[in-house]
């Protein structure tokens, strides 16, 4: 014959544990029902009556089967530098993540406690490592033969165009200017040019296979900077 199913509350066999979605009540010394997610224990069980559950109130939640006397409060509303990626319901907490152009400088169990604006690389510097949800942009000086004339959290250093005849040599923050209407060739569009190891800009040691390549790469004027993001600390 199959063993009889015990209904809560019941006294567990010595040395055994309560079943899934049950808990052992120390006071009643019985196995009692847990409350489902979105509920909490309004009345704890006794030897003769099971747990009485009730729904969580607005702005509170329980995510797991539980026997807590009160639901947990949802986190405060997301700040202006965040977006709500999960709403507060009876069964889940609100989750705030950083809005585009920001990263999480201080995380919490779920979501982000403190967002910070992604660093913008100034002219003469390019993005060497892009920002992620949890890490800032890393800016590095443009290597010889490359430039960035923007203030940006996404722009990398781009190669100078190569001219038949150079009107103005390129540098770290300005492309070469050609005398003719079009350059002889340009590096592959979209090619990633991160700073190169052991290049010494001021000594002009970059290879110059054609006399028309721009020799000088010290910083020069940027083209239209954008102001720092609000709340930026420059870290």
């Amino acid at each position: 014959l199959p063993a009889q199913v015990a209904f809560t509350p019941y006294a567990p066999e010595p040395g055994s544990t309560c079943r899934l979605r049950e808990y052992y009540d120390q006071t009643a010394q019985m196995c009692c029902s847990k409350c489902s997610p979105g509920q909490h224990a309004k009345v704890f069980c006794t030897k003769t009556s099971d747990t009485v559950c009730d729904s969580c109130e607005d702005s509170t939640y329980t995510q797991l089967w539980n026997w807590v006397p009160e639901c947990l409060s949802c986190g405060s509303r997301c700040s202006s530098d965040q977006v709500e990626t999960q709403a507060c319901t009876r069964e889940q907490n609100r989750i705030c993540t950083c809005r585009p152009g920001w990263y999480c400088a201080l995380s919490k169990q779920e979501g982000c406690r403190l967002c910070a604006p992604l660093r913008k690389c100034r002219p003469g510097f390019g993005v060497a490592r892009p920002g992620t949800e949890t890490s800032d942009v890393v800016c590095k000086p443009c290597a010889p033969g490359t430039f960035s004339n923007t203030t940006s959290s996404t722009d990398i250093c781009r190669p100078h165009q190569i001219c038949n005849v150079v009107a103005i040599p390129g540098n770290a923050s300005m492309d070469a200017v050609c005398t003719s209407t079009s350059p002889t060739r340009s590096m592959a569009p979209g090619a990633v040019h991160l700073p190169q190891p052991v290049s010494t800009r001021s000594q002009h040691t970059q290879p110059t296979p054609e006399p028309s390549t721009a020799p000088s790469t010290s910083f020069l004027l940027p083209m239209g900077p954008s102001p720092p993001a609000e709340g930026s600390t420059g870290d």
Epitope: A143, P195, Q196, P197, S218, P222
Partner: antibody
């Protein structure tokens, strides 16, 4: 907490060289370039140059191209400046300062190292 | 290279005064100017970056403004702790400091 700890004062003979250090802590050393700045006694600040610890690349003010050599050691998070062919003109305090390549150059500085050139 | 002409070289002010220091660049620096305070025997301290953005911990009595080639730095209500030298720095074309301004109290 970000800190740039520089080595102690140096005395050098004319014609000799000195190498001073700047040990970084509290941040990712390779994410920032390191500048060096000279301040002669009672004078203003002069930019010497920078080193990128990650790649070893450097740039110098024209005036210091033959005088200073900037290097960095990522294993010890330390940047160095070597001053060669010392003369009395090199007697000064030398500062290191980091730069994030964004809006805040020199947001943290070392305490400075006094180099005295004397025979 | 860009030159930075800073004036005046020295300033004498009474407590509570407003003082202004100017820096003129030899060419347009597109707001890439920072201001530093240096007290005797100490390293400089960044006060203002990108013309007018106060660094964290910089008192609100400090301010900066300007564009193109001309920039200014002001202390609106001078306090005794402001006795120091002040330097501008352009950081768009390599880096160049101004010659400095020494602030004294009358």
């Amino acid at each position: 907490e970000v800190q740039l700890q520089q080595s102690g004062p140096e005395v050098g003979r004319p014609g000799s060289s000195v190498k001073i250090s700047c040990k970084a802590s509290g941040y990712t050393f390779t994410d920032y370039i390191m500048h060096w700045v000279k301040q002669s006694p009672g004078q203003g600040l002069e930019w010497i140059g920078w080193v990128d610890p990650e790649y070893g690349s450097t740039d110098y003010a024209e005036k210091f191209k033959k005088k200073a050599t900037l290097t960095a050691d990522t294993s010890s998070n330390t940047a160095y400046i070597q001053l060669s062919s010392l003369t009395s003109e090199d007697t000064a305090t030398y500062f290191c300062a980091r730069d994030d390549g964004s809006y805040s150059p020199f947001d943290y500085w070392g305490q400075g190292v006094m180099v005295t050139v004397s025979s | 290279d860009i030159q930075m002409t800073q004036s005046p070289p020295s300033l004498s002010a009474s407590l509570g005064d407003k003082v202004t220091i100017t820096c003129q660049a030899s060419q347009n620096i597109n707001k890439y100017i920072a201001w530093y305070q240096q007290k005797p025997g100490k390293a400089p301290r960044l006060l203002i970056r990108y013309t007018s953005t106060l660094e964290s911990g910089t008192p609100s009595r400090f301010s900066g403004s300007g564009s193109g080639r001309d920039y200014s730095f002001s202390i609106s209500n001078v306090e005794s702790e402001d006795i120091a030298s002040y330097y501008c720095l352009q950081y768009v074309n390599l880096l160049t400091f101004g010659a400095g301004t020494k602030l004294e109290i009358k």
